[in-house]
Interface confidence: medium
């Protein structure tokens, strides 16, 4: 039975040209995290594998940095970066947990962070 929950940074916003940290945290489970995928719609951004470490997809390597922790840092943001991001935790023996973050990249300097929320 999957008992874990993923806490994410929720709905967030950031300025065009700036950076943002995408963070997820898996709690309430003793399952071993074997891999974390970061994805945007159907595009794989990065993988953090327990054995291999980090791998950033070649098409994103100039604008994506690993960390902090299992999070992901997006740099040089553009309006096109607006959208849904998913952290996918591969765990054993539980299976897969998915967290969702919505990022809005703003033209103006008004960029407020949304509240944290949980996905069961």
């Amino acid at each position: 039975m999957m008992t874990g929950t993923i806490e994410t940074t929720g709905n967030i916003s950031a300025e065009k040209g700036g950076s943002i940290i995408l963070q997820c945290h898996l709690s309430s489970t003793t399952a071993q995290v074997t891999q974390v995928n970061w994805e945007q719609q159907d595009q794989l951004l990065a993988i953090c594998n327990a054995d291999l470490g980090w791998h950033i997809s070649p098409s994103f390597k100039d604008r994506v940095a690993p960390g902090p922790g299992l999070g992901l840092t997006l740099q040089s943001l553009t309006v096109n970066d607006t959208g849904e991001y998913f952290c996918i935790y591969h765990t054993y023996p539980d299976g897969t947990y998915t967290g969702r973050i919505f990022l809005e990249v703003l033209e103006s300097s008004v960029a407020e962070h949304g509240a944290r929320f949980q996905i069961p």
């Epitope: 071993q32 074997t34 891999q35 995928n37 994805e39 159907d42 595009q43 794989l44 993988i47 594998n49 327990a50 054995d51 291999l52 791998h55 997809s57 070649p58 098409s59 996918i88 591969h90 054993y92 023996p93 299976g95 897969t96």
Partner: antibody, heavy 124, light 111 residues
Framework: EVQLLESGGGLVQPGGSLRLSCAAS????????MSWVRQAPGKGLEWVAG????????YYADSVKGRLTISRDNSKNTLYLQMDSLRAEDTAVYYC??????????????????WGQGTTVTVS | QSVLTQPPSASGTPGQRVTISCSGS?????????VHWYQHLPGTAPKLLIY???QRPSGVPDRFSASKSGTSASLAISGLQSEDEADYYC???????????FGGGTKLTVL
């Protein structure tokens, strides 16, 4: 040392069954997706089936759907291929292979970095 | 008929540079999926040579390189050596077939 060792191949009559096994060692088996790839005599490599690290997601080539079944036992570090309703065209060397990642949402991206030596299946 | 098209054979002399092409379509090489290259000597386990279009696994000499453009990919081997004589396969996930597909393989001969 990362190692994959296939077994279970042999000679079988058309319509018969076989179960191939692949024993994994030297890496965390529960972290990675796995696949079976075959090579018929005088032909190239052909992917047959794949399975995610947890066993929840399975993928098959059209040519084997409904006849071949991939599974894994993570407690035994072993990958299986159950082969039913075998045909002459299934004659090949069957390789098991480890993917670079777990394979739930990323199976389509990452290739196979470790392969076994293969086991021969002859349908005749 | 393979989904990915490779020349059946290629050859070169020691020290030469050889290129092997791999042609696909918009549903495999032309998508956001990646191309992988394998080296296979008959009777042995296939070996991953290049992954994610152009990345070399540790232990693979930098004489091997690869690139992708549009619906085609290519593998280049510089400073050809006798031990490079083998079959080379390109591979990618095909979205239309929902399957990993391989090229027909290219037999490289070192003269």
């Amino acid at each position: 040392e990362v190692q994959l060792l296939e077994s279970g191949g042999g000679l079988v009559q058309p319509g018969g069954s076989l179960r191939l096994s692949c024993a994994a060692s030297g890496f965390t088996f529960t972290t990675y997706a796995m696949s079976w790839v075959r090579q018929a005599p005088g032909k190239g490599l052909e992917w047959v089936a794949g399975i995610s690290y947890i066993g929840s997601d399975k993928y098959y080539a059209d040519s084997v759907k409904g006849r071949l079944t991939i599974s894994r036992d993570n407690s035994k570090n072993t990958l299986y291929l159950q082969m039913d309703s075998l045909r002459a065209e299934d004659t090949a060397v069957y390789y098991c292979a480890k993917h670079l990642t777990g394979g739930t949402t990323d199976y389509y991206y990452y290739g196979m970095d470790v392969w076994g030596q293969g086991t021969t299946v002859t349908v005749s | 008929q393979s989904v990915l098209t490779q020349p059946p054979s290629a050859s070169g002399t020691p020290g030469q540079r050889v290129t092997i092409s791999c042609s696909g379509s918009t549903s495999n090489i032309g998508t956001s999926r990646y191309v992988h290259w394998y080296q296979h000597l008959p009777g042995t386990a296939p070996k991953l040579l290049i992954y994610l279009d152009s990345q070399r696994p540790s232990g693979v000499p930098d004489r091997f390189s690869a690139s992708k453009s549009g619906t085609s990919a290519s593998l280049a081997i510089s400073g050809l050596q006798s031990e490079d004589e083998a079959d080379y396969y390109c591979s990618a996930w095909d979205d239309s077939l929902s399957a990993w597909v391989f090229g027909g393989g290219t037999k490289l001969t070192v003269l």
